[in-house]
Each structure stands twice: as C-alpha cells, then as structure tokens.
C-alpha cells in the first residue's frame, strides 16, 4: 500500500512467546509521510483497549519506518495478553491489529517451551 496515510505494521494474529523476568521490547512499526503522529499503546481487556499510562516507551528510526516501542523491564506474568498501538493522525485514530504476548512464568516452568509448543496452547489459537 503506497499512500500518505499513517500505517501501522503489526500483523494480524501475531504473537510473541516471552518469559517472565526477561526484558522485552514490543515494537509498533509506523509509516508516515511528513509529521510523526502521536502513538500510544493499550492492552485489551475483553473488547476494551485500556491505554497504558506511565510506561517506558521510546522511538527508533530506521530508513523507511519508525518504531514506537513499549519496554517491559522486566516482563511480568501479568503482562500476558493482547496489545494494540494506535496513532492520532489528522484528528483520526488509526488502530493496529492486536498482537499477543504469551508470558511463561519461569518459576513454574521446568524448561522453556519451544515456539511450536507455545503455538499449541488452545487459548492462544483463538486470540
């Protein structure tokens, strides 16, 4: 898609398998033309996405894309769930697809499960 609209490049039904206690950066790739939009992260609670306030966020600039990053320092078990970024552009809100963080609490896991094992968790298949 080539346009001067803001575009948020989070894949639909994407997810990340991560571990409690590790640091993690959740990236929202943002494409814009002239002025960088205001971008925020929210966490889904049912059908409502609750804005994340007071969290460590940052921007990273690459050649054709900017990344609005939500930092987890470290990941907590309660960070499990689905997140969405949204951009405020010309008084309109552009929302990304949601992306799911599947957090394994290493205290309760004897070993770190593989990516395929993560994918087999039934609740995740319907996220």
């Amino acid at each position: 898609k080539e346009s001067c609209d803001v575009q948020l490049y989070i894949k639909r039904q994407s997810y990340h398998s991560i571990f409690a206690g590790d640091p993690f950066k959740l990236e929202c790739p943002v494409k814009y033309c002239a002025h960088r939009p205001q971008v925020t992260w929210c966490k889904l609670n049912g059908t409502t996405c609750v804005k994340l306030e007071g969290r460590h966020t940052s921007w990273k600039q690459e050649k054709n894309l900017s990344f609005f990053i939500l930092h987890f320092e470290p990941v907590l078990p309660s960070d499990n769930g689905s997140y969405r970024c949204s951009a405020n552009f010309l008084s309109a809100i552009i929302e990304s697809h949601s992306t799911t963080l599947y957090v394994t609490d290493v205290k309760s896991a004897s070993e770190r499960p593989s990516k395929d094992e993560m994918a087999s968790r039934p609740w995740l298949l319907y996220s």
Epitope: Y9, K11, L125
Partner: antibody
C-alpha cells in the same frame, strides 16, 4: 508481482519423509504469512499450517501437529514443509501460499507439487 | 474447528446466467476487529486456486466486477452476475478468522 515456485515433490515410500520448498519473489516474506494446503485427487482443500517468517512462529491443523514442520529462511525468501511418517493417504498436490500479514491485500498460491506415497 | 458448508455442491448454468453460491459457517466469522475473514477461491482443473474475494466482499485486483460477495456472521454468498465461459470452475469458500483455517467442500460450476 508476487510469485511462488514450489519444488521437492515426487514419489516417496510409505513411512518416509518429504521436504517441499516454496520460493517467493516480488515480496519480502517477513511481511507475510506463508501457509501450506494440500488437495488429494478429485477432493477438496485441506489446510496444513502456516508460518510467520518474521519470527518463525507456526500454527498447525490438529491432524498434522507432530508430523508436519513448517519453516522459513528469510535470507532465501523461501518457506518449507517437512512431512514425516508418510502414508498412502498423504498422496496429494501440495500448495504453498502467501498473504499480506498486515492488510490481506494479496493472497497468492504456488503452482502446486505432486507428492505420491507408494511402495 | 469451524465447519464451512457450501451449497450447492454442483451447479449447471448457461453463459449469461446469474449464479449464486452460498457458504455457511458453524460459528460466526466476526473477528474482534469487527471484520469477517471470509474468502472465495476459484480453481480450474489442473490449476492452483486463485483468490477472488476477501473480507466477504472485497475483490482482488484483476477480478471482473461481475463477481461479488456478501453476507455476515455465519451466512455468505458469492454471486456471478452474468456467467462467462471462463467462469466454469470449482469455487471454495474458506475462513481466516480462527485456527485451523477451514474450507468449504467446493461448488463445481458446469456448463448446461
């Protein structure tokens, strides 16, 4: 233009394995999801699974879990399907396909490769 | 798994006819983003399937405007307003809302 070229089909003995390749052009596969579907002669379409080439995460249909492995090599812009413990009923045309992970703006299928499982 | 049921399974029609194929899912295809991920494919003998319609009603580029899709929830239709000789093929619906992805059994459109 997005295009896919499959290879690796042919005759396989029962109990054997196959590894099919699917090379993409016209798109960076890291921006896509790639998936595999099979079709037995005269039958319908059966979804095997998919991969997110950006991180290697996979999903499988229950009937293929543990027997199929989908992988990708983004440096070669190629996805793979390995299927183990082959049975005669795995004889089919195997298709790979690719779609835009962000906007669903394209969904392109390969030409298909015939796998025959027979002794 | 979501069951996708197409009807009819085969259909004889003539060039110029208006044709409707229906697809019913065993549960709603409405995703959390408010969209229904229902696709229609066309497959000709010996060829790979080709997507015609996605998100219920969006036409892929290059697909003639005589093809249209509609529906919501669990009931969807593919309509060809005026059949052309190149439209005789098998048509499949399939859902991309939940895993595993599932296909209808196909509708074979034959020349009367």
């Amino acid at each position: 233009e997005v295009q896919l070229v499959e290879s690796g089909g042919g005759l396989v003995q029962p109990g054997g394995s196959l590894k099919l390749s699917c090379a993409a052009s016209g798109v960076n596969i890291k921006d896509t999801y790639m998936y595999w579907v099979r079709q037995a002669s005269g039958k319908g379409l059966e979804w095997i699974g998919r991969i997110d080439p950006a991180n290697g995460y996979t999903r499988y249909a229950a009937s293929f879990k543990g027997r199929a492995t989908i992988s990708a090599d983004d440096s070669k812009n190629t996805a793979y399907l390995q299927l183990n413990s082959l049975k005669t009923e795995d004889t089919a045309v195997y298709y790979c396909a690719v779609y835009d992970g962000y906007y669903e703006s394209f969904d392109v299928w390969g030409q298909g490769t015939l796998v025959t499982v027979s002794s | 798994d979501i069951q996708m049921t197409q009807s009819p399974s085969s259909l004889s029609a003539s060039v110029g006819d208006r044709v409707t194929i229906t697809c019913r899912s065993s549960q709603s295809l409405l995703d959390s983003d408010g969209k229904s991920y229902l696709n229609w494919l066309q497959q000709k003998p010996g060829k790979a399937p080709k997507r015609l319609i996605y998100l219920v009603s969006k036409l892929d580029s290059g697909v003639p405007s005589r093809f249209s899709g509609s529906g919501s929830g669990t009931d969807f239709t593919l309509t060809i307003s005026s059949l052309q000789p190149e439209d005789f093929a098998t048509y499949y619906c399939w859902q991309g809302t939940l895993f595993p992805r599932t296909f209808g059994q196909g509708t074979k459109l034959e020349i009367k």
